[in-house]
Amino acid sequence: VEVQVSEDPVVALVDTDATLRCSFSPEPGFSLAQLNLIWQLTDTKQLVHSFTEGRDQGSAYSNRTALFPDLLVQGNASLRLQRVRVTDEGSYTCFVSIQDFDSAAVSLQVAAPYSKPSMTLEPNKDLRPGNMVTITCSSYQGYPEAEVFWKDGQGVPLTGNVTTSQMANERGLFDVHSVLRVVLGANGTYSCLVRNPVLQQDAHGSVTITGQPLTFPPEA
């Protein structure tokens, strides 16, 4: 028996369902009574789901997994993982035993988009050219860790005096806070871009200083 899986990682959004594809080629006359299918976490060998002795033994993984029972006899051994969590990320092994056996591993990459950044200034009044200001860009509930980029109004990257922190919450999602310290010119726009490297999703936020008063562009 030869097991085949997708070589590319499966990307799944948090709280959605993912299908880990796995297939084998049944011989003529194959019956489910001959099939032993085991899904497990590759690294820890923790059992996830199994079909043995001619029946679905069910989920051994927080009751969020299912096979496709009607498709098994055709050689479809794929696993459905419901309500994906950050902790589900990793490699899963699909093991198929009929007379002989084979196995293959498929990777699950979990992702969550970052929210549109909110921008804050400190201080936020009585600003004069030459003042040092702190601009904070905050974006929430993303995964995996973001890449943060700052630019001025001319699109020139601002790399000095940037401090970025990323904190995971109880669900494993990251809240990003990036702080830019700049000396104000007469006027200017400062923008931050929060990129999710897996989803290739960019979330933009900006603040424009036009002498007095300061204005924030409307939310898009």
Partner: antibody, heavy 117, light 109 residues
């Protein structure tokens, strides 16, 4: 070409334990199933137990349950069989064998274990 | 637990003759049956798997047949090197457990 090379002969006292190794070369060890089969002098073949390294689980013949432990080290492509509480009846040649293509297609050369006081 | 019974215990034949070895299972094993040859001081050698498929490098004079509970290994014309002990073996479906028959000794008459 896959080969299984076993550790050398052992002489043990009754009540002690023996650990025999079986090193695989060629192929992908984690996708093997390795069994241990013994043969007492002048007797037939007796399956003791086996392990599928990729699953990390071993299972044993009822006769040996509790007395035999089979393990595998994927990093060195080596399977081990440890038999405890040895008695004279355990004197035998111990073989490791790979399950592949519907049968034990590759066998180690055998390890003679003699239990004698 | 499935028990495999081989018969006869000893078979005495001459080179060139046809040998028929039997293996009976206490319950159906489907087609999951293998045959091995073992010579003194050597490890067993796989001859037949899945009841009737010859293993790589096994001469055509060896053939296997049967399904369910009754299986036969036939050697069409015995060569001097064929005199040895022959074992049948089955695999339980899951978890994988294996059983050997007690063996048939094929000796020169």
């Amino acid at each position: 070409q896959v080969q299984l090379v076993q550790s050398g002969a052992e002489v043990k006292k009754p009540g002690s334990s023996v650990k025999v190794s079986c090193k695989a070369s060629g192929g992908t060890f984690s996708s093997y199933a390795i069994s241990w089969v013994r043969q007492a002098p002048g007797q037939g073949l007796e399956w003791m137990g086996g392990i599928i390294p990729i699953l990390g689980t071993a299972n044993y013949a009822q006769k040996f349950q509790g007395r035999v432990t089979i393990t595998a080290d994927e990093s060195t492509s080596t399977a081990y069989m440890e038999l405890s509480s040895l008695r004279s009846e355990d004197t035998a040649v111990y073989y490791c064998a790979r399950w592949g293509g519907g049968a034990f297609d590759i066998w180690g050369q055998g390890t003679m274990v003699t239990v004698s006081s | 637990e499935i028990v495999l019974t081989q018969s006869p215990g000893t078979l005495s034949l001459s080179p060139g003759e046809r040998a028929t070895l039997s293996c009976r299972a206490s319950q159906s094993v489907g087609g999951y049956l293998a045959w091995y040859q073992q010579k003194p001081g050597q490890a067993p050698r796989l001859l037949i798997y899945d009841a009737s498929n010859r293993a790589t490098g096994i001469p055509a004079r060896f053939s296997g047949s049967g399904s369910g509970t009754d299986f036969t290994l036939t050697i069409s014309s015995l060569e001097p090197e064929d005199f040895a002990v022959y074992y049948c073996q089955q695999r339980n479906n899951w978890p994988p457990m294996y059983t050997f028959g007690q063996g048939t000794k094929l000796e020169i008459k």
